[in-house]
């Protein structure tokens, strides 16, 4: 469920302290509700990013069990379609801290609503 | 040349346990996720276990949860199938498999060990 | 559970001639990064299943030509251009977009 999502986004985060990652991440800051799910693919997408730059084991473990997560709960609802939606390039660019802090916001957005 | 070995397979009572193993070589062990797959005589493929690189990771589907543990020992490259409370339905030559993750290009299991047969009847 | 079907369930195929194997999802297996995870495997007679393609169209390295992989959301396709007696077996769709993984029933392809 979503509460594994947000552990997997700590251990990520806590993981990441110890490295020194500089990319910076199409970010969504300020997610409208009929937006989320797509939203969740451009966090998804950076995600895998994050994984490939670290090169660490860990975190490519954590990252691909968030994405299986994401994918079986977002599944069990069914095929959710979102129109006027912005594009992942279109986001702001941001510092990896920024982008679990928003990650874990957009996260908790589908807690509330489930 | 990718080496996987599966062993451990033998005859065993309903209810009973086993452990099956799997020697790997000939490639970066820890780098790679591995599955379990099984076959039961005559019939399809069935997957049975993941599990992550590091291990902290594992998945199974409804009908060996709880029952099977898939395990892996990087220094030994080794991987592991404990299987607890084993039924008649159970029966299969079981495969252990290397599984390419999504990060390096995608999912598959892209080599497969020769099998290990395991017969579970009274 | 995803459930995949194949057809059709045996394949008598003249050596030289093309054979078509069809899968099918239950639900789209495309995942929420946008990626199709969908793989065929052939088991001939007596051997371990061996990966033939990978992400629906992607031959896997040794994999002859002759094989290719198509479809996309529910529908896919395993073709065979030119089918050889080393071809013959069973050939299995496998998608691991979601957990649990599944299998499809299998395709028997046997020489006529």
């Known amino acids: 469920n979503w509460v594994n999502v947000i552990s997997d986004l700590k251990k990520i985060e806590d993981l990441i302290q110890s490295m020194h990652i500089d990319a910076t991440l199409y970010t969504e800051s300020d997610v409208h509700p009929s937006c989320k799910v797509t939203a969740m693919k451009c966090f998804l997408l950076e995600l895998q990013v994050i994984s490939h730059e670290s090169g660490d084991t860990d975190i490519h473990d954590t990252v691909e069990n968030l994405i299986i997560l994401a994918n079986n709960i977002l599944s069990s609802n069914g095929n959710i379609t979102e129109s006027g939606c912005k594009e992942c390039e279109e986001l702001e660019e941001k510092n990896i801290k920024e982008f679990l802090q928003s990650f874990v916001h957009i996260v908790q957005m589908f807690i509330n609503t489930s | 040349e990718v080496r996987l070995m599966a062993s451990g397979g033998g005859l065993v009572q309903p209810g009973g346990s086993l452990r099956l193993s799997c020697a790997a070589s000939e490639f970066t062990f820890s780098n790679y996720a591995m599955s379990w797959v099984r076959q039961a005589p005559g019939k399809g493929l069935e997957w049975v276990a993941t599990i992550s690189r590091g291990g902290d990771y594992t998945y199974y589907p409804d009908t060996v949860k709880g029952r099977f543990t898939i395990s892996r020992d990087n220094s030994k490259n080794t991987l592991y199938l404990q299987m607890n409370s084993l039924r008649a339905e159970d029966t299969a030559v079981y495969y252990c498999?290397?599984?390419?993750?999504?990060?390096?290009?995608?999912?598959?299991?892209?080599?497969w060990g020769q099998g290990t047969l395991v017969t579970v009847s009274s | 559970d995803v459930v995949m079907t194949q057809s059709p369930l045996s394949l008598p195929v003249t050596l030289g001639q093309p054979a078509s194997i069809s899968c099918r999802s239950s639900?789209?297996?495309?995942?929420?990064?946008?990626?199709?995870?969908l793989e065929w495997y052939q088991q001939r007679p007596g051997q371990s299943p061996r990966l033939l393609i990978y992400?629906?169209?992607n031959r896997f390295s040794g994999v002859p030509d002759r094989f290719s992989g198509s479809g996309s959301g529910t529908d896919f396709t395993l073709k065979i251009s030119r089918v050889e007696a080393e071809d013959v077996g069973v050939y299995y769709c496998f998608q691991d977009s979601f957990v649990p993984y599944t299998f499809g029933q299998g395709t028997k392809l046997e020489i006529k």
């Open positions: 992400k629906v169209f």
């Open positions: 639900q789209s297996i495309v995942d929420i990064t946008g990626n199709t995870y």
């Open positions: 498999a290397r599984r390419v993750s999504m990060i390096t290009g995608g999912y598959a299991m892209d080599y």
